[in-house]
Interface confidence: low
């Protein structure tokens, strides 16, 4: 009686169980009563990453420099190429099809977490006692200058965007 299910790494065709092709190889012809499944290795720019019955290998992903991408890991006959983003950019999506510039934190905000190849800059508002006067993808909020430690007094209060202005103490004669 012909089989209705096949073992692992086999597939059912014409009431017969044929061996799947191993990763890195594509199917050329199905097995018959008298012959084994015929498989061929994928070419240099192609891959298949599973036991399969595919008649075509998949093209390696192209890391398009115009999309800000570069090769992180070269593909093999069994694995796809892994792309990552150039410096200053991060992936637009999980599949990293293209990259976008890291966000800069505006004055009044500091960098809480510097961007990576896959995540954008995380900004945070500068709390009281701290400021940022630049738009930057790297700079954290900086503490206001301590006038007292310089034997000076505060002449102008600081804000989240500006440092305090220190000046000499008025000396009574």
């Amino acid at each position: 009686e012909p089989p209705t299910a096949c073992r692992e790494k086999q597939y059912l065709i014409n009431s017969q169980c044929c061996s799947l092709c191993q990763p890195g190889q594509k199917l050329v012809s199905d097995c018959t009563e008298f012959t084994e499944t015929e498989c061929l290795p994928c070419s240099e720019s192609e891959f298949l990453d599973t036991w399969n019955r595919e008649t075509r290998c998949h093209q390696h992903k192209y890391c398009d420099p115009n999309l800000g991408l570069r090769v992180q890991q070269k593909g093999t006959s069994e694995t796809d190429t892994i792309c990552t983003c150039e410096e200053g950019l991060h992936c637009m999506s999980e599949s990293c099809e293209s990259c976008v510039p890291h966000r800069s934190c505006l004055p009044g905000f500091g960098v809480k977490q510097i961007a990576t190849g896959v995540s954008d800059t995380i900004c945070e508002p500068c709390p009281v006692g701290f400021f940022s006067n630049v738009s930057s993808a790297f700079e954290k909020c900086r503490p206001w200058t301590s006038c007292e430690t310089k034997d000076l007094v505060v002449q102008q209060a600081g804000t989240n965007k500006t440092d305090v202005v220190c000046g000499p103490q008025d000396r009574q004669r």
Partner: antibody, heavy 120, light 107 residues
């Protein structure tokens, strides 16, 4: 299929600024980038820059040296192009054109164009 | 910037004939070239992207070829609606740049 509707024609004096809008039929331009291209009378098309609505990331044509600003209002599914310090050579039809992330420069959907005339 | 040069500037062709438009890049742009059709008073329309991929819905009479610095748009049998200006665009490097256009007119 994305439809892009642009704001109406504008007449501006030299030195002024103009802001052109581009409203999409797709919610917040999800999955798309927005390019801006202009065409002066009888001239070739000229790419001005692109914006990624997803996070506001922009890339500009340096020819415009800080005169162009691209922004997005995701909640209104509208992209904006502002051009400042206008001169007579900026008289042109300005187009927005959207592209899928998978091919961000294909510019497969275009607005109808907005004529900006700069004249004293 | 990369300069895209199209030739000829004007091409006079009879309906039913074949039209071959050329676009040359000043440096290697690999296959990062798109072709657009523009009719008077209308926005450009994407025909071909990545040098040879036809956009969905574009008739099979339009085909693109080439890589590196030399690209060709071929219209195998011109229909009356094909008379227009055609632009090539490179998107290998910023700024993206268009050719100056080829006007295809009725002979």
């Amino acid at each position: 299929q994305v439809q892009l509707v642009q704001s109406g024609a504008e007449v501006k004096k030299p030195g002024a600024s103009v802001k052109v809008s581009c409203k999409a039929s797709v919610y917040s331009f999800t999955g798309y980038t927005v390019n801006w291209v202009r065409q002066a009378p009888g001239q070739r098309l000229e790419w001005m820059g692109l914006i990624v609505p997803y996070n506001g990331g922009t890339t500009y044509n340096q020819k415009f040296k800080g005169r162009v600003t691209l922004t997005i209002d995701k909640s209104a599914s509208t992209a904006y192009m502002e051009l400042s310090s206008l001169r007579s050579e900026d008289t042109a039809v300005y187009y927005c054109a959207s592209s899928r992330y998978s091919n961000p420069y294909a510019m497969d959907y275009w607005g109808q164009g907005t004529l900006v005339t700069v004249s004293s | 910037e990369i300069v895209m040069t199209q030739s000829p500037a004007t091409l006079s062709v009879s309906p039913g004939e074949r039209a071959t438009l050329s676009c040359k890049a000043s440096q290697n742009v690999h296959t990062r070239v798109a072709w657009y059709q523009q009719k008077p008073g209308q926005a450009p329309r994407l025909l071909i992207y990545l040098a040879s991929d036809r956009r969905t819905g574009i008739p099979a009479r339009f085909s693109g070829s080439g890589s590196g610095t030399e690209f060709t748009l071929t219209i195998s049998s011109l229909q009356s609606e094909d008379f227009a200006v055609y632009y090539c665009l490179q998107h290998w490097n910023y700024p993206l740049t268009f050719g100056q256009g080829t006007k295809v007119e009725i002979k």
